[in-house]
Interface confidence: medium
């Protein structure tokens, strides 16, 4: 119980005091306050909210609260020239047009500045052509189309359903397939849970609802015009042609009412199998083009959005540490929303606000954490994690030397079934121990721990009696801290039952219907799940900032490294002949993992025994723990992804949201049977095994006795 030993501690000022100060009613009040108008990045409304949060954090008692601004590339629809899609007849007349906006929810009819649905960073264009339905537009969907069905998407407009993978990956795949435009839509199979009413009568997506979102492929670059460096006053900006990650073809999102009109006329090939059928009453024919009677009709896109360099504002609050002020524990979540942000991000921002208030209350009573806590309200997350990335680029030298941990705080809920945690293996034991001390908010688990309900509802696939904890991927503001800088990171939220709800995310994600009422009426009327998430996020920050010894267990990294090595080896072993031909061996990797395991075990033994009253030795041991995550960083980055530098984890090349283990080896092996030069391809596999083995061995040595 190391927290109670922190400096200036009185019996009152422990983790319990911090947790007891967190109140569901406050979170509810903050959520309401943050969701009454839109807070789109780059707008005056979001600047005003930044100043309000700055003022309130100061009132709560933080030592300093500053705004950090950057001028980054954002994207907006043209207010006088709206985006839409039409069906045109042989004379070029528009016989059907998609809707220009979502019908506003009750009570919000007179709200101004609701940005209509658009795909941020789409280039302008008015392509017309035949439609091809490409399912989810995943890598495997295009393999099915091109290789098995011999359907050529070149010069076609593709229509893809949202879900399964990040929308930017869908657009990248469509571009590579030669498409000249992309239509994204929400199918009820993915965004309508059976038996639940659509908003405002329930939490399902109505037919006119549309998911907004950026379609970039930044690969961790941040602002597309200033990759690697902050977008400050004296920044050198690339020309738009050299900008990182921008799509090259027009893209636009629609709802399922409009999708029905496009899909019901589709002809050409039948869907290859049932996994290509959604839940609209249409044949889900792949195309290309419309069926018999409608074969002369085409689809035309009208996209007029513009990219603009715009000022954004992060709010950075500091609570100075009493003993190790040069060690930073960071709690950050974004503030910008697509519209009202009822869930994304304000359910998270409201929790951060209450955590700041609780810490501030303790500080006013004379307490300080051992280490410095930084609180961040990030801007422009929705436009590519821009606020967090620019700040981290500006402060990278400090962060890589002083960063202990980063806890992310976007949406607190995506359901109300059980806890969901993604984090570095270093934090597994912290999360386990913390959740054992917290009460479960779940029905049927009264008087039981959060750990118990979580484990029951979301069991680990590998270890019985333990809950599932997932790998970190991307798509949120931890990316730069973890994937680029190698700072131990974690995230927690309440989620849905993935077994019974197969829809992607939550149905109203990034739509106008993501309101305060959605949360208050349907997801969490008592705000008990929000409170639990506040306790988890806040509790992690408290322990990370206050424990005498950092609450990291390096042995858990050893366990997963072995698991990941086994997994990548088994993928490679699908090609036994080639492994023999090209002398591909994983011995070096397994040897490095074995060494890591032994050294981590010895380090853990020393950690139990060392003299904690010796501040030099304590600092030395803590630094070895802090820098372990950093040791997995390869300064050269992954191939073609220089800002993804973590050798053990990276966002999947096929889905930014998902984490991939040993990503360098994985990508080298992916679809290797189709490579034109197998010798070169297997040579790259060998090189990636070498990089991984070296990195694991080098990381292990950072845990060895220093002399």
């Amino acid at each position: 119980k190391s927290s109670n030993e922190a400096t200036n501690i009185t019996p009152k000022h422990n983790m319990k005091a911090f947790l007891d100060e967190l109140k569901a009613e406050n979170i509810k009040k903050f959520l309401y306050n943050f969701t009454q108008i839109p807070h789109l990045a780059g707008t005056e409304q979001n600047f005003q909210l930044a100043k309000q949060i700055q003022s309130q954090w100061k009132e709560f008692g933080l030592d300093s609260v500053e705004l950090a601004h950057y001028d980054v590339l954002l994207s907006y629809p043209n207010k006088t020239h709206p985006n839409y899609i039409s069906i045109i007849n042989e004379d070029g007349n528009e016989i059907f047009n998609t809707s220009l906006f979502e019908p506003p929810p009750p009570g919000y009819e007179n709200v101004s500045d609701i940005v209509p649905p658009f795909s941020a960073f789409s280039p302008q264009g008015m392509p017309e052509g035949d439609l091809v339905y490409v399912n989810y537009a995943r890598t495997e969907d295009f393999f099915k189309l091109e290789r098995d069905m011999k359907i050529n998407c070149s010069g076609k407009i593709v229509i893809a359903r949202y879900g399964k993978v990040f929308r930017g990956n869908k657009v990248k795949n469509a571009q590579l397939a030669g498409a000249k435009g992309v239509i994204l839509y929400s199918d009820p199979a993915d965004y309508f849970a059976p038996g639940v009413k659509s908003y405002p009568d329930g939490w399902n997506l109505p037919g006119g609802g549309v998911q907004r979102g950026n379609i970039l492929n930044l690969n961790g670059a941040g602002d597309p015009l200033t990759p690697g460096y902050p977008a400050n006053e004296y920044a050198y900006r690339r020309g738009i042609a050299e900008a990182v990650g921008l799509p090259s073809i027009p893209v636009h999102p629609i709802g399922y009412y409009d999708a029905q009109k496009l899909l019901e006329k589709m002809g050409g090939s039948a869907p290859p199998d049932s996994s290509w059928r959604g839940s609209l009453k249409v044949p889900y024919n792949v195309g290309p083009g419309f069926t018999g009677n409608f074969s002369t009709q085409k689809v035309k896109m009208h996209i007029h959005s513009t990219n603009e360099v715009t000022r954004i504002y992060n709010v950075i609050g500091t609570l100075r540490g009493a003993v190790e002020p040069d060690r930073y524990v960071i709690l950050g979540g974004h503030r910008d929303s697509w519209v009202f942000g009822g869930i994304d991000p304000q359910s998270g921002a409201a929790v951060v606000h209450e955590i700041v208030r609780s810490f501030g209350t303790l500080k006013k009573e004379g307490w300080r954490p051992r280490r410095t806590i930084l609180f961040a309200s990030w801007d422009a997350e929705e436009f590519g994690l821009l606020g967090s990335t620019e700040w981290a680029e500006e402060n990278s030298r400090l962060l890589q030397e002083r960063g202990v941990a980063y806890i992310n705080a976007d949406s607190s809920i995506e359901g109300n079934y059980t806890l969901r945690v993604d984090c570095t293996p270093l934090m597994y034991s912290l999360v386990h121990n913390l959740t054992k001390e917290l009460k479960s908010p779940d029905e049927g688990f009264e008087g039981k721990s959060l750990y118990e309900s979580w484990t029951k509802k979301s069991p680990s696939p590998e270890f019985s009696g333990m809950p599932r904890i997932s790998k970190l991927g991307s798509g949120n503001d931890f990316e730069v801290f973890f994937q680029r800088l190698g700072i131990a990171s974690g995230r927690a939220r309440y989620t849905k039952n993935w077994e019974t709800n197969k829809f992607s995310g939550y149905p109203l994600y990034h739509s106008v219907y993501e309101t305060y009422e959605l949360v208050e009426k349907f997801y969490d009327p008592m705000f008990k799940y929000h409170l639990t998430v506040a306790q988890v996020r806040g509790g992690m920050v408290f322990e990370l900032a206050n424990s005498i010894v950092l609450p990291f267990d390096c042995r858990d990294y050893a366990v997963v490294l072995r698991k990941y090595a086994d997994k990548i080896y088994s993928i490679s072993m699908k090609h036994p002949q080639e492994m023999k031909t090209y002398s591909v061996s994983f011995d070096s990797l397994f040897s490095a993992v074995k060494n890591f395991t032994e050294i981590a075990s010895k380090f853990s033994e020393r950690l139990q025994d060392f003299d904690k009253s010796n501040p030099i030795v304590l600092r030395m041991m803590n630094d070895q723990l802090m820098f372990l995550e950093r040791a997995f960083i390869d300064p050269l980055g992954l191939p073609d992804r220089p800002f993804y530098r973590h050798v053990i984890y990276a966002p999947s090349s096929h889905n930014k949201y998902a984490g991939e283990s040993f990503p360098g080896i994985y990508d080298a092996l992916f679809d290797i049977e189709s490579k034109v030069d197998p010798s070169k391809a297997w040579g790259e596999v060998k090189r990636q095994i070498y990089v991984a083995a070296f990195t694991v061995q080098a990381a292990a040595e950072t845990l060895s006795e220093v002399a």
Partner: antibody
Framework: QVQLVQSGGGLVQPGGSLRLSCAAS????????MSWVRQAPGKGLEWVAN????????YYVDSVKGRFTISRDNAKNSLYLQMNSLRAEDTAVYYC?????????????????WGQGTMVTVSS | AIRMTQSPSSVSASVGDRVTITCRAS??????LAWYQQKPGKAPKLLIY???SLQSGVPSRFSGSGSGTDFTLTISSLKPEDFATYYC???????????FGGGTKVEIK
């Protein structure tokens, strides 16, 4: 509680008319498609007609088109079936039923609430 | 119009038996299928929707499966109250048309 209560059945001669009524309670009647389903003696179920929430769309099985009219009065929470030019083969128990749009707006997939049924006998 | 063919038209079974009823659509209907139970002199009762989703309050011994053209209703262990007639119904062509299968009577052996 949620229920549908029917009235208006009876014996009628071929060529005659009859009006069936269905009173809804316990739910927001105006939010649902509604239907009539019938069952001839000793036979299976046959869908007869559908009407949209606001009455703007109506659909009928081929065998009753031009003879039967489905209608609703949302202010009275009531559904109606006006049956004209009745034939012997129209003899059946008629059920009103709520169409549950469980999958997405107006997809109308299953009949989750049924009336108790009313017998219509067409005979000379 | 979509035709729904149920088989068998009747089945004799004992309490505790596993009973399987099939329904075939004349063309693909995705998962737009519901199953009903009807007892003599009573209105039908919804058991399964979306081919496999159990309606609230229906015992878990009832289950549905299938997609496209072939569907199955299974009663895992027959109870005395399960002796009735069962109907499938497609809604792929809603709202223009709805079709029921001919029914399967589950009788006491």
């Amino acid at each position: 509680q949620v229920q549908l209560v029917q009235s208006g059945g009876g014996l009628v001669q071929p060529g005659g008319s009859l009006r069936l009524s269905c009173a809804a309670s316990g739910f927001t009647f105006s939010s649902y498609w509604m239907s009539w389903v019938r069952q001839a003696p000793g036979k299976g179920l046959e869908w007869v007609a559908n009407i949209k929430q606001d009455g703007s769309e109506k659909y009928y099985v081929d065998s009753v088109k031009g003879r039967f009219t489905i209608s609703r009065d949302n202010a009275k929470n009531s559904l109606y079936l006006q049956m004209n030019s009745l034939r012997a083969e129209d003899t059946a128990v008629y059920y009103c039923a709520r169409v549950w749009d469980y999958y997405y707006d107006s997809s109308g997939d299953a009949f989750d609430i049924w009336g108790q049924g009313t017998m219509v006998t067409v005979s000379s | 119009a979509i035709r729904m063919t149920q088989s068998p038209s009747s089945v004799s079974a004992s309490v505790g038996d596993r009973v399987t009823i099939t329904c075939r659509a004349s063309q693909g209907i995705s998962s737009w299928l519901a199953w009903y139970q009807q007892k003599p002199g009573k209105a039908p009762k919804l058991l399964i929707y979306a081919a496999s989703s159990l309606q609230s309050g229906v015992p878990s011994r009832f289950s549905g499966s299938g997609s496209g053209t072939d569907f199955t209703l299974t009663i895992s262990s027959l109870k005395p109250e399960d002796f009735a007639t069962y109907y499938c119904q497609q809604a792929n062509s809603f709202p223009r048309a709805l079709t029921f299968g001919g029914g399967t009577k589950v009788e006491i052996k």
